[in-house]
Interface confidence: low
């Protein structure tokens, strides 16, 4: 009795770049690394039935279900999905294994269900069952982490109420500025919820799940640092927890820290202090001000004072709803073909925004950078000197913001011509928008200098292609010019371009392009 062929079932996730219905394929597209689906023999089943692990797929994701058969000789196969037979073309890989693939492009609800694969080898017949379902990401959430004090301990707990359960990590850094970027050796990440070492320069907590990654920085006033030119500002929504850390280093322990809100000392239970000696035997003290759930009356200037350092303040503003403050008036820019240029939007927002830049229905990633004055900035430089309309869109839990930009690239006109039995038309996309002249070429005017003014109709910006204006000029046919060559010329401050058209009987028209700078 011959051994059963060895079956391997794999799932391949693809980067989406196509759209189609599920199809059987002998050569699946280039992809991510395969995931083994197990393919165990189904107990108590008549015949040889293998069952793959259930497959959950995101809407619009593309996958390949693939079976590798370590069977001697040729194999034939058939896919069945929702009682319909689908074509199946096995091929053999370099290890001489039979490979059968089912590609599902752009997953939809209709493509979810049971996929049955029947394989016939020289030795055995067997069935493989795949169950494909759509992952319910509608229930998924990713909330910004917040801090809580750990009961009876000098430690902070980082909490993110997200679905699925997020991985929470602390991101710690003891350097200043640029060296605290994520990839720097100065950055330490701790994949745990509780943090005891609260003396670092920069402390953030991040939560990540299938939807991405959200981080919250522990707002800190450092009395040993020169204060910012503008007062640091912290926004919170009603009901959110407030945490501010005041930090100070001194040569010895003979100093104390206090918090005041609008010149009144914070109540007991709204602060706690920690201290430690640093490696050079100086004393580090930190004093936390915290409110477990803020109300409107927690708004104001929070001042940290020390007996040995100048005091520093932060303005805490409690808002009912999140906001995005920026000027939404549209902006037009005119640049040369090789000029370096970036669009930029300066905004103040709470909570932090998610944003995109869009051009020609294509979205681009959006980076934002915090400025010292409480504002943030997002720049977009990847326009590749393509003229048109660019859109910046930002949103947070409570607000949305859209700003339009128009980019014009200064260049001399390029002319395209069309002709019909009754008229000739010329189009140009140069910028600034060109002006037009029509000239007749005749025996009297072999250089085409005889200007035509009758029957000319100019339309400026008659067609908008993703914000790119196109100018056109149309010449209506008259007996006086039928059968002649005419020349349309578009000119602007950067040059002139012309096209010559033969106005004869209807049919295809030859065009001769002239470029005149």
């Amino acid at each position: 009795n011959q051994d059963l062929p060895v079956i391997k079932c794999v799932l391949i996730n693809h980067k989406n770049n196509d759209s189609s219905v599920g199809k059987s394929s002998s050569y699946p597209m280039v992809s991510e690394s395969p995931e083994d689906l197990g393919c165990a023999l189904r107990p108590q089943s008549s015949g040889t039935v293998y069952e793959a692990a259930a497959v959950e797929v995101d809407v619009s994701a593309s996958i390949t279900l693939q079976v590798l058969v370590d069977a001697p000789g040729n194999i034939s196969c058939l896919w069945v999905f929702k009682h319909s037979s689908l074509n199946c073309q096995p091929h053999f890989d370099l290890q001489n294994r039979g490979v059968v693939s089912m590609v599902i492009l752009k997953m939809t609800e209709t493509q979810a269900g049971e996929y049955l694969l029947f394989i016939q080898s020289e030795a055995t017949n067997y069935t493989i069952l795949f169950t494909v379902s759509i992952r319910n990401t509608l229930l998924y959430t990713l909330r910004r982490p917040y801090f809580r004090k750990m009961e009876n301990q000098d430690a902070l707990v980082c909490i993110s109420e997200s679905v699925p359960e997020p991985i929470v990590e602390w991101v710690l850094c003891d350097s200043q500025g640029e060296s605290c970027k994520e990839e720097s050796p100065a950055v330490v990440k701790k994949e745990e919820k509780v943090l005891h070492e609260l003396f670092g320069t920069d402390i953030r907590c991040c939560a990540r799940n299938e939807l991405g990654r959200e981080c919250t920085r522990l707002f800190t006033i450092d009395l040993n640092q020169t204060p910012q030119t503008t007062l640091p500002q912290l926004f919170l929504k009603v009901g959110e927890p407030l945490w501010i850390r005041c930090k100070a280093v001194h040569v010895n322990h003979g100093f104390g820290l206090t918090w005041e809100l609008e010149n009144k000392a914070l109540e007991e239970g709204n602060y706690f202090e920690m201290s430690t000696y640093s490696t050079n035997r100086t004393m580090i003290r930190i004093l936390f001000a915290f409110v477990s759930s803020v109300a409107r009356n927690d708004t104001g200037y929070y001042t940290c004072s020390s007996s040995k350092h100048p005091s520093q303040s932060a303005l805490v503003t409690i808002v009912e709803k999140g906001f995005i403050n920026a000027t939404n008036s549209s902006e037009d820019y005119e640049i040369d073909q090789y000029e370096e240029f970036c669009f930029s939007v300066r905004f103040k927002a709470y909570p932090q925004i998610r944003c995109t830049w869009t051009f020609s229905r294509k979205s681009f990633p959006c980076e934002q950078k915090g400025l010292d004055n409480g504002y943030s900035i997002s720049k977009f430089c990847n326009h590749k000197h393509q003229p048109g309309e660019y859109i910046f869109h930002a949103e947070n839990d409570d607000a949305q913001f859209t700003k339009m930009f128009t980019l014009n690239i200064r260049r001399k006109p390029q002319v395209l011509a069309e002709a019909s039995a009754s008229q000739a038309s010329c189009f140009s996309d140069g910028y600034p928008l060109p002006s037009w002249t029509w000239k007749k070429c005749s025996d009297k005017s072999p250089n085409c200098t005889e200007e035509i003014t009758e029957g000319v109709w100019n339309r400026k910006a008659n067609r908008k292609v993703f914000g790119q204006w196109v100018s056109s000029s149309t010449l209506n046919m008259s007996e006086a010019i039928k059968g002649f060559l005419v020349k349309c010329c578009a000119y602007n401050s950067l040059g002139t371009s012309c096209e010559t058209i033969l106005l004869n009987s209807p049919g295809p028209f030859p065009f001769i392009q002239d470029n005149i700078s």
Epitope: E183, S184, P185, V187, K190, E197
Partner: antibody, heavy 120, light 107 residues
Framework: QVQLVQSGAEVKKPGASVKVSCKAS????????MHWVRQAPGQGLEWMGR????????SYAQSFQGRVTMTRDTSTSTVYMELSSLRSEDTAVYYC?????????????WGQGTLVTVSS | DIQMTQSPSSLSASVGDRVTITCRAS??????LGWYQQKPGKAPKLLIY???SLQSGVPSRFSGSGSGTDFTLTISSLQPEDFATYYC?????????FGQGTKVEIK
């Protein structure tokens, strides 16, 4: 200051195992990955694997899979690297090395190295 | 595995020379690259991390550049203490492979 102190030189016979220790001090032991890198005489550096001292999870280079085991003892801030089924080509200096951050990155501190000689 | 190819494998230079060592990755590693200096009988020492960031305490004559697959370590004016072997290492994905090394010798 940060220090990684490794155990002394070892001479082993082919087929035997060796266990090298690396004691860390001067920083929070569980906050940094510990990598192991070896260097055969006159040769370049070869990455062997890493351990996360916080949770104990490991990742090994394919060429050492099945022969290397990395462990840690948080009570003594020490990591261990055990290499089994030794062959003469395993003669090398073995370094433990500290890497900030959970996702790799550059090695900012190295141990002094432990010479392991495999000879019959 | 990602292969790291360093060139040249050795070079001779004089004090004051500008020296450039290149490192090429077999696939895109963004800027996840470190440069190390090793002297005989000693452990390597980190010079550059994240392709271009200078490790604290390292002289500013050392600089790194590049991203993606091509990277460069430059020593603007070679000093007597710089004669050593230099290695690049990618930390983009496990295993974190090293280049084969470039030995900088006195001319």
């Amino acid at each position: 200051q940060v220090q990684l102190v490794q155990s002394g030189a070892e001479v082993k016979k082919p087929g035997a195992s060796v266990k090298v220790s690396c004691k860390a001090s001067g920083y929070t032991f569980t906050s940094y990955y510990m990598h192991w890198v070896r260097q055969a005489p006159g040769q370049g550096l070869e990455w062997m694997g890493r351990i996360n001292p916080s949770g104990g999870s490991t990742s090994y280079a394919q060429s050492f899979q099945g022969r290397v085991t990395m462990t840690r003892d948080t009570s003594t801030s020490t990591v261990y690297m055990e290499l089994s089924s030794l062959r003469s080509e395993d003669t090398a200096v073995y370094y433990c090395a500290r890497v900030p951050g959970l996702y790799g990155g550059a090695i900012d501190y190295w141990g002094q190295g432990t010479l392991v000689t495999v000879s019959s | 595995d990602i292969q790291m190819t360093q060139s040249p494998s050795s070079l001779s230079a004089s004090v004051g020379d500008r020296v450039t060592i290149t490192c090429r990755a077999s696939q895109d590693i963004r800027n996840d690259l470190g440069w190390y200096q090793q002297k005989p009988g000693k452990a390597p020492k980190l010079l550059i991390y994240a392709a271009s960031s200078l490790q604290s305490g390292v002289p500013s004559r050392f600089s790194g550049s590049g991203s993606g697959t091509d990277f460069t370590l430059t020593i603007s004016s070679l000093q007597p203490e710089d004669f050593a072997t230099y290695y690049c290492q990618q930390s983009y994905s496990s295993p974190f492979t090293f280049g084969q090394g470039t030995k900088v010798e006195i001319k």
